[in-house]
C-alpha cells in the first residue's frame, strides 16, 4: 500500500481521533516508507556481507545518488526551512530512477519494494502541497534516466547487488535527515 | 569484541579545551549514529550531541558553538572538542551507539565513561 | 521537547510492582527509551519504541505509552533492579537542552 493504514483519503476519522494534519501525515509517511527499506535491506543484507562494509570501503562507484549537505539547509547549523523542502523534493525525485531500478531485484520482497516505490510518490505529493517555491524545483529529465536505468540493468551480478545495497542505504539516510529536518518545520 | 572506549578526560583550567576520543571497535562507526552523553557528580544524565551515518550533526542547545563532534573514519573514531570549559563541564563523558539507526535516537553500546575535571 | 520524569526517587521491596513515568512536553510518537544506570557504570537501554524489550532484558520489564506519557514497569521488583533509570526521546534532538528525563532512583524499603 502506498500510505500507512488508516491514512488512505477516503478513510473516515473516528470519532475520537483527530483526521492528521499535513505535517503528521508526512511524518507518519516517511517512517512507513523507511520501515519498508529496513525490510528490503534485510533481504540484500541476508544475501551479502556489503551491510557491514565501512562506507568508504563502498564509495567507489559511479551512481549519483542524492546526499545532504550543509548548503542545503536542512541541518541543524544553517538551517533553512525553504531552501531544506526544495532540497528534499528535488531528492526524491532524483531517487525515483533508482527505485524504479529496485523492481525486480527482490525475491521475497517484491511486494516491499513496490510499496516504497508508490509510497515515495504519494510523499513527494504531499511535499509538493507544503512547498511554496515549487519553481525551484527541478524535475529530472526522462530521457537521461531511461539511459541510467538501462546501464545499471547492464551491470553484471556483483554490481548490481552493490547498486541495489547503495541505493537503499542512500535512500534510507536521505529520508532520515529529511525527516529530522521536517520535524523542525 | 564490539566495544565503545573513551580517553582524553582529564583535569583542565576554566577557558580551557579537550578534546575526547572514542574509539569503536568490532564494526564500522560511519555507519551508525554516535551521541555523547554526560553526567556530572551525582547528577543525571545529560545529552550533549550527536553525528549521524551522514557526518550531520545535532547539540543540545547549551552546546552549540563550545561543543563539536567529528569523526575520523579511517581511525575509526569519534571526537569531541570542547572549548571555553567551565567548572559545570565536570563530568563524566560517555560515547554510545545507536545499534538500529532507524530513525528515532536510542543507545544500547555505551563506552565505560571518561572524567573531565574543570578546576583551577 | 522537555522530559519530565516522575517519581524523583522511590523506596520498593523485593517482588514489588514498580511504575515509574516519562511525560513529554509535546507528542513524540512512541520514540521514548528507558534505560538503567547502576552507581559507576554505563547506562544499559532496557526498552525502545515505549515498548520494546532490548535484547537480553527479563521480561518483568515492560514499557506503555504514546504520545506524550509514558510508563516503565518492573512487575516484580528483584535484587538486582535497585538502579536509576532514566527515559529518553528519540523524536528530536534539535532545540532541546537534554533528551533525557531527569532520573528516577529506586531504593530498598
Known amino acids: 500500500a502506498p500510505v500507512p493504514p488508516g491514512e488512505d483519503s477516503k478513510d473516515v476519522a473516528a470519532p475520537h481521533r483527530q483526521p492528521l494534519t499535513s505535517s503528521e501525515r508526512i511524518d507518519k509517511q516517511i517512517r512507513y516508507i523507511l520501515d519498508g527499506i529496513s525490510a528490503l535491506r534485510k533481504e540484500t543484507c541476508n544475501k551479502s556481507n556489503m551491510c557491514e562494509s565501512s562506507k568508504e570501503a563502498l564509495a567507489e562507484n559511479n551512481l549519483n545518488l542524492p546526499k545532504m549537505a550543509e548548503k542545503d539547509g536542512c541541518f541543524q547549523s544553517g538551517f533553512n526551512e525553504e531552501t531544506c523542502l526544495v532540497k528534499i523534493i528535488t531528492g526524491l525525485l532524483e531517487f525515483e530512477v533508482y527505485l524504479e531500478y529496485l523492481q525486480n531485484r527482490f525475491e521475497s520482497s517484491e511486494e516491499q519494494a513496490r510499496a516504497v516505490q508508490m509510497s515515495t510518490k504519494v510523499l513527494i505529493q504531499f511535499l509538493q502541497k507544503k512547498a511554496k517555491n515549487l519553481d525551484a524545483i527541478t524535475t529530472p529529465d526522462p530521457t537521461t534516466n531511461a539511459s541510467l536505468l538501462t546501464k545499471l540493468q547492464a551491470q553484471n551480478q556483483w554490481l548490481q547487488d552493490m547498486t541495489t545495497h547503495l541505493i537503499l542505504r542512500s535512500f534510507k539516510e536521505f529520508l532520515q535527515s529529511s525527516l529530522r529536518a521536517l520535524r523542525q518545520m | 569484541e564490539v566495544q565503545l572506549v573513551e580517553s582524553g578526560g582529564g583535569l583542565v583550567q576554566p577557558g580551557g579545551s579537550l578534546r575526547l576520543s572514542c574509539a569503536a571497535s568490532?564494526?564500522?562507526?560511519?555507519?551508525?549514529?554516535v551521541t555523547w552523553v554526560r553526567q556530572a557528580p551525582g547528577k543525571g544524565l545529560e545529552w550533549v550531541g550527536i553525528?549521524?551515518?551522514?557526518?550531520?550533526?545535532a547539540y543540545a542547545t547549551w552546546a552549540i558553538g563550545r561543543f563539536t563532534i567529528s569523526r575520523d573514519n579511517s581511525k575509526n573514531t569519534l571526537y569531541l572538542q570542547m572549548n571555553s570549559l567551565r567548572a559545570e563541564d565536570t563530568a563524566v563523558y560517555y560515547c554510545?551507539?545507536?545499534?538500529?539507526?532507524?530513525?528515532?535516537?536510542?543507545?544500547?553500546?555505551w563506552g565505560q565513561g571518561t572524567l573531565v575535571t574543570v578546576s583551577s | 521537547i522537555q522530559m519530565t520524569q516522575s517519581p524523583s526517587s522511590l523506596s520498593a521491596s523485593v517482588g514489588d510492582r514498580v511504575t515509574i513515568t516519562c511525560q513529554a512536553s509535546?507528542?513524540?510518537?512512541?520514540?521514548l527509551s528507558w534505560y538503567q544506570q547502576k552507581p559507576g557504570k554505563a547506562p544499559k537501554l532496557l526498552i525502545y519504541?515505549?515498548?520494546t524489550l532490548a535484547s537480553g532484558v527479563p521480561s518483568r520489564f515492560s514499557g506503555s505509552g504514546s504520545g506524550t506519557d509514558f510508563t516503565l514497569t518492573i512487575s516484580s521488583l528483584q535484587p538486582d533492579d535497585f538502579a536509576t533509570y532514566y527515559c529518553q526521546q528519540g523524536y528530536s534532538l534539535r532545540n532541546i537542552d537534554n533528551a533525557f528525563g531527569g532520573g528516577t532512583k529506586v531504593e530498598i524499603k
Open positions: 554510545a551507539r545507536d545499534d538500529s539507526s532507524d530513525w528515532d535516537a536510542k543507545f544500547n553500546l
Open positions: 519504541r515505549a515498548s
Open positions: 553525528i549521524y551515518g551522514s557526518d550531520e550533526t
Open positions: 568490532g564494526f564500522s562507526l560511519s555507519n551508525y549514529y
Open positions: 509535546q507528542s513524540i510518537n512512541n520514540e
